[in-house]
């Protein structure tokens, strides 16, 4: 069936255009030659003016942005929600781990509290900060924990006769901690497990946050003028001929969209790789690569490390007695 | 003998956490996220098609608009942009992505590289030197509960289970913060903790 003849008065076009732009000044009363048009180039008289064309272009680009936003809405929500949930979950794990460790000290080594609570608190603060991307070195955190704990263990449990707050011997004890390997291989074990599990956790969160950034970027893309022209021709130029109910051809729409989105579609290759790499990472997040597993068991490893010190207590006290004799004499003087 | 935190531990020899059958864990939540993400793996390549299917396009009509005129839906002219002199579609593609898109591609390349570096090579997860350094006894098979760095007096087994969603809403705290009293119960070898809702500093 042939199309209806174009409206001789542009009346229909006016009522359509009024929805986009209240105020009718821009729509001609009757079809005009349209020699000033740049996008909707007419084959005959047209009901469009240059100003209308500009408005159509603006509307077309806005439509496109809205379509893009609705396309990504579900994906965006999925990643944003999960990033928040995992971040909070990791914080809860850290808090539990801290509580378990404090409880272990309180029940097994009450003489080491409250100093132990302070060191444990600081250690887990750094764990949290590290997960959130802070530039802290895991080995430094673990070393600091054992360096801080040993003087307290020595002065409170192994040699409780020493006067309190013996500063000079603390220097010596901190040094002895590493020189004599007083905790055996436990600090090294904790370093390995904590650094591996936290690295993976941190990159997992970083990846989710980057996912949000990728979607946000495409969500707020501003389309080029060329794209705006193509969209206008596809969606609105038919109006100029009074063809209000006609829809664009499917194949034509695909061609236009591919043109408009040529740049965006280039993300595809890297996006696929991103999801597959993230899957690979997640598949490997168990045992020492699972922070939940490692951190919630840390209290036990720390407990074992202190037991190790106690087991070797006699030997250690003698060695440290000699090594730090100078410091101890000064204190008793 | 040692006292252990919470109701997690019953006896140092077993130290098993009660396992709630379908309880949601962090690892199951992670796997679920990946499955959902994989359904969006073609998101970017499918965008042009998605937008066309969500904007007015002639589906059942015999005639459609090709940018210049009304044509039959299945004619050669339907897929082709009639206005050849206007500007070239090929040119538009040749311009390359916008700077903001190039930037995001660079960031994706970087994170992909990091993810690949961090991914645990299959079969290497149980690297003895790392996973069990300093451990003296007990065998932790793949199907068993996780083993955590432990001592000679029995493997410490902890089922890797955070009651994930419940924890988020109602979360156990033993912090030395006001209102959080911690009671050592010598008789039962456990600690009872008053719970507090929300995040304590």
């Amino acid at each position: 069936q042939p199309p209806p003849p174009p409206d001789a008065t542009c009346h229909q076009v006016r009522s359509f255009f009024q929805r986009l732009q209240p105020g009718l000044k821009w729509v001609p009363e009757t079809p005009v030659p349209g020699s000033d048009l740049q996008v909707c180039l007419p084959k005959g008289p047209t009901c469009c003016s240059r100003k209308m064309e500009e408005k159509y272009q603006l509307t077309a680009r806005l439509n496109m942005e809205q379509l893009l936003q609705s396309a990504s809405m579900e994906l965006k929500f999925l990643i944003i929600q999960n990033a928040a949930v995992f971040q909070e979950a990791f914080e809860i794990v850290v808090r539990h781990a801290k509580n378990y460790t404090n409880a272990m000290f309180k029940n097994n080594y009450p003489s080491l509290t409250p100093q132990a609570f302070e060191f444990v608190g600081e250690f887990f603060t750094d764990v949290s900060l590290y997960i959130l991307g802070s530039d802290i070195n895991v080995d430094d955190m673990v070393n600091e924990l054992f360096d801080s704990l040993f003087p307290v263990i020595y002065t409170q449990m192994m040699n409780p006769g020493l006067p309190e707050s013996v500063l000079d011997i603390n220097e010596c004890l901190r040094g002895a901690r590493r020189d004599l390997k007083v905790f055996g291989s436990f600090p090294k074990l904790i370093m390995t497990q904590v650094s591996k599990s936290l690295q993976v956790t941190r990159i997992f969160l970083q990846a989710l946050n980057l996912g949000i950034e990728v979607i946000n970027t495409t969500d707020h893309l501003k389309f080029s003028k060329d794209c705006g022209r193509m969209l206008t021709r596809m969606w609105y130029c038919s109006y100029c001929q009074g063809l209000m109910m006609v829809k664009p051809c499917g194949g034509y729409c695909n061609v236009v969209m591919q043109g408009c989105m040529a740049g965006v579609v280039e993300i595809d290759k890297y996006w696929r790789e991103y999801i597959l790499s993230l899957e690979e990472l997640v598949n490997g997040m168990y045992r020492i690569y699972d922070m939940e597993n490692v951190l919630l068991g840390l209290f036990s490893t720390i407990h074992d490390s202190i037991q190790y010190v106690q087991k070797n207590g006699g030997k250690l006290t003698t060695t440290i007695g000699k090594l730090c004799a100078h410091s101890q004499q000064r204190q008793y003087r | 003998s040692a006292y252990y935190p919470e109701d997690l531990f019953i006896d140092k020899k077993i130290l098993k956490v009660a396992h709630v059958e379908h309880e949601e864990t962090l690892s199951s939540r992670r796997r679920e996220l990946i499955q959902k993400l994989k359904s969006f793996i073609n998101f970017y390549s499918a965008l042009p098609g998605y937008i066309c299917s969500h904007s007015p396009v002639a589906e059942n009509d015999t005639l459609c608009w090709n940018g210049q005129e009304l044509v039959e839906r299945y004619s050669q002219k339907a897929a082709r942009n009639g206005m050849k002199n206007q500007f070239n579609l090929h040119e538009l593609k040749m311009k390359g992505p916008e700077p903001v898109v190039s930037q995001i591609i660079d960031k994706l390349k970087h994170i992909n590289q990091l993810l690949r570096t961090m991914s645990v090579p299959k079969g290497k997860v149980l690297d003895k030197s790392l996973d069990e350094e300093g451990l003296e006894s007990g065998d932790c098979g793949d199907d068993e509960d996780e083993c955590i760095g432990s001592s000679g007096d029995g493997m410490v087994k902890v089922k890797n289970q955070l009651r994930f969603l419940a924890e988020l809403a109602y979360d156990l705290d033993v912090d030395d913060a006001p209102g959080n009293k911690q009671h050592g119960n010598q008789k039962d070898n456990e600690i009872t903790t008053s719970h507090s809702v929300g995040n304590m500093p």
């Epitope: 608190g121 949290s128 070195n137 955190m141 070393n143 360096d147 220097e171 901190r174 | 500093p201």
Partner: antibody, heavy 120, light 112 residues
């Protein structure tokens, strides 16, 4: 007892680099971090950076491109170096031992200071 | 960076008097872990600074108990209950809650 002794030239030209050595005694560099701070009439006290017991470093972001802190544990020495010093880098430079917990710590013992004038 | 503002710039006192120095930070020094990393140093004339008080109110080893620190959030105070001659010099507050560490401009405690 704990001591930090500094040594370095008092006068530096902009074309040279500013180098100061901090030699410590009474404690081991394998168990304590050492910070660097400077004091000038115009800017007051300004934290420059730290080297931890592991050898890892943290720097003030404003100066990161010009600073380098290294150490030799066996000699108990920490080396501070600033490239392309300008006139407004003239100050008294101090090294100090880290007390407390890593970057949330404080300087519990200080060196005697090295007065540096940058002049062409 | 966190700006630390000390008042007064100069504090003339008589020996035996009480002295009070104020330090204000441009943002809260309360860390997410519940601790506040605000410290006080004293620099006597021609010498290096010495640590007096760490984490708001903890006296460093060997510091007399006439020195006390208090405050929270962004407002902190150092009090000297009875000023002695060896207390004269410039007092600095410093924070390590946020990186980089920053210092106050100093308060000079001098004899009236």
């Amino acid at each position: 007892q704990v001591q930090l002794k500094q040594s370095g030239p008092g006068l530096v030209q902009p074309s040279q680099s500013l180098s100061i050595t901090c030699t410590v005694s009474g404690f081991s560099l394998t168990s304590y971090g050492v910070h660097w701070v400077r004091q000038s009439p115009g800017k007051g006290l300004e934290w420059l950076g730290v080297i931890w017991s592991s050898g890892n470093t943290d720097y003030n972001a404003v100066l990161i491109s010009r600073l380098s802190i290294k150490k030799d544990d066996s000699k108990s020495q920490v080396f501070f170096k600033m490239n392309s010093p300008q006139v407004d880098d003239s100050a008294i430079y101090y090294c100090g031992r880290n007390g407390g917990w890593l970057l949330r710590g404080f300087m519990d013992f200080w060196g005697q200071g090295t007065s540096v004038t940058v002049s062409s | 960076d966190v700006v630390m503002t000390q008042t007064p710039l100069s504090l003339p006192v008589s020996l035996g008097d009480q002295a009070s120095i104020s330090c204000r930070s441009s943002q809260s020094l309360l860390h997410s872990n519940g601790n506040t990393y605000l410290h006080w140093y004293l620099q006597r004339s021609g010498q290096s600074p010495n640590l007096l008080i760490y984490k708001v109110s903890n006296r460093f080893s060997g510091v007399p108990d006439r020195f006390s620190g208090g405050g929270s959030g962004t407002d902190f105070t150092l009090k000297i209950s009875r000023v002695e001659a060896e207390d004269l010099g410039i007092y600095f507050c410093s924070q390590s809650t946020h990186v980089p560490w920053t210092f106050g401009g100093g308060t000079k405690l001098e004899i009236k």
